[in-house]
Interface confidence: low
């Protein structure tokens, strides 16, 4: 195992989770671990210098980011409550307050609303037959290529994420109740002939 920083012929670092290719110096360097950020970029002679994220900020993954992400509180006004606090390596975990359920937009729970009597289960969505009263709820399965992952009276099936649009590759296919899981593609060097 080579110790960063090191040069490698095909620009594919040995441990792609914890190392990255630094094009400025044509070397493989260490990423910073969760909870830390790059204080000084590596050079030919010195590896990455990492520092702990400042108070009220975090980085969740091995990274070569120059800053940490700002912690955001769970928004009570939008119906959320905190399950776990923000730490240097994890953002705050929020969930809907009791008696409320998620309203999704682009696969993200954007706010919570009061649950009604009929809850559509994951993999289904509400088919509203009385548009005016919005009371007669019938749950129908998601169409192919869509998913819905919560129990909610107004849940709508969302299209599966297309990893390639985000420059990612598919790690696991989507189902009717879960989205496609994307991952970073192999480091550019892995594509070299």
């Amino acid at each position: 195992q080579l110790v960063p920083p090191y040069r490698i012929e095909n620009q594919t670092c040995w441990d792609q989770d914890k190392e990255y290719y630094e094009p400025m110096h044509d070397v493989c360097c260490s990423r910073c671990p969760p909870g830390e950020f790059v204080f000084a970029v590596c050079s030919r002679s010195q590896d990455t210098v990492c520092k702990t994220c400042p108070h009220n900020s975090y980085n969740e993954h091995w990274n070569h980011l120059s800053t940490c992400q700002l912690c955001r509180p769970c928004d009570i006004v939008l119906g959320f409550e905190e399950v776990a606090p923000c730490t240097s390596d994890r953002k705050a975990e929020c969930r809907c307050q009791p008696g409320m359920s998620c309203v999704y937009l682009d696969n993200e729970c954007v706010h919570c609303e009061e649950e009604r009597l009929v809850l559509c289960q994951p993999g289904t969505e509400a088919e509203v037959t009385d548009e005016i009263m919005d009371t007669d709820v019938n749950c129908v399965p998601c169409k192919p290529g869509h998913f819905q992952n919560t129990s909610s009276p107004r849940a709508r099936c969302q299209p599966h994420t297309r990893c390639e649009i985000q420059g990612l590759v598919e790690a696991a296919p989507g189902t009717s109740y879960s989205d496609t899981i994307c991952k970073n593609p192999p480091e550019p060097g892995a594509m070299l002939l």
Epitope: E9, N10, Q11, P23, M24, D26, S66, P188, L192
Partner: antibody, heavy 114, light 107 residues
Framework: EVQLLESGGGLVQPGGSLRLSCAAS????????MTWVRQAPGKGLEWIGV???????YYTDSVKGRFTMSRDNSKNTLYLQVNSLRAEDTAVYYC????????WGQGTTVTVSS | DIQMTQSPSSLSASVGDRVTITCQAS??????LSWYQQKPGKAPKRLIF???SLESGVPSRFSGSGSGTDFTLTISSLQPEDFATYYC?????????FGGGTKLEIK
């Protein structure tokens, strides 16, 4: 001082071929990836591709299968073989040091015309 | 590929003016951005790398800033030799991409 000197350009007919060279000095050539960039007359800069220190290559889509990069580390020289040339390949061709293109040569002109 | 949108495409200014050129990436590129100056008939010369680091020998009137998707090149007080075309370039992804260029002309 880092110096890069391209050569091999000229006038060629559509469908023809040329071999461009880039002689490097002033740095440890074998350590560095090297980049080719071109600039059509009156236009902006277009990345062609990169060749790493061991000879691995990566090309832009428009030249894949027609252009081939190679290098001879013992001669401190970089090459770009350009085949099946088209009118739209008319440009000044630059070699540049590293995959980030930090220092450039003066360029060599390729004109594709019948 | 990452697209780089540079503005303005041309700019008229006078000696002594402060000039700002902007570059926007189609996706986040951290600080993997360079700025180049090109004079007619000459090769591009890198002025700034890593968004804000000045190449040695480049006058301090040139400065760069930005991170993520939005970047700026500033010339604090234009000199006669600064009239040229300026390009931004990302090197976050292996396939380098350049902005369309900004031609800086004398007013």
């Amino acid at each position: 001082e880092v110096q890069l000197l391209e050569s091999g350009g000229g006038l060629v007919q559509p469908g023809g071929s040329l071999r461009l060279s880039c002689a490097a000095s002033g740095f440890t050539f074998s350590y560095y990836a090297m980049t080719w960039v071109r600039q059509a007359p009156g236009k902006g800069l277009e990345w062609i591709g990169v060749i790493n220190s061991g000879g691995g290559t990566y090309y832009t889509d428009s030249v894949k299968g027609r252009f081939t990069m190679s290098r001879d580390n013992s001669k401190n020289t970089l090459y770009l073989q350009v085949n099946s040339l088209r009118a739209e390949d008319t440009a000044v061709y630059y070699c540049a040091k590293a995959s980030t293109a930090d220092v450039w040569g003066q360029g060599t002109t390729v004109t594709v015309s019948s | 590929d990452i697209q780089m949108t540079q503005s303005p495409s041309s700019l008229s200014a006078s000696v002594g003016d402060r000039v700002t050129i902007t570059c926007q990436a189609s996706q986040g590129i951290s600080n993997y951005l360079s700025w180049y100056q090109q004079k007619p008939g000459k090769a591009p010369k890198r002025l700034i790398f890593a968004a804000s680091s000045l190449e040695s020998g480049v006058p301090s009137r040139f400065s760069g800033s930005g991170s993520g998707t939005d970047f700026t090149l500033t010339i604090s007080s234009l000199q006669p030799e600064d009239f040229a075309t300026y390009y931004c370039q990302q090197y976050n992804s292996y396939s380098l991409t350049f902005g369309g260029g900004t031609k800086l002309e004398i007013k």
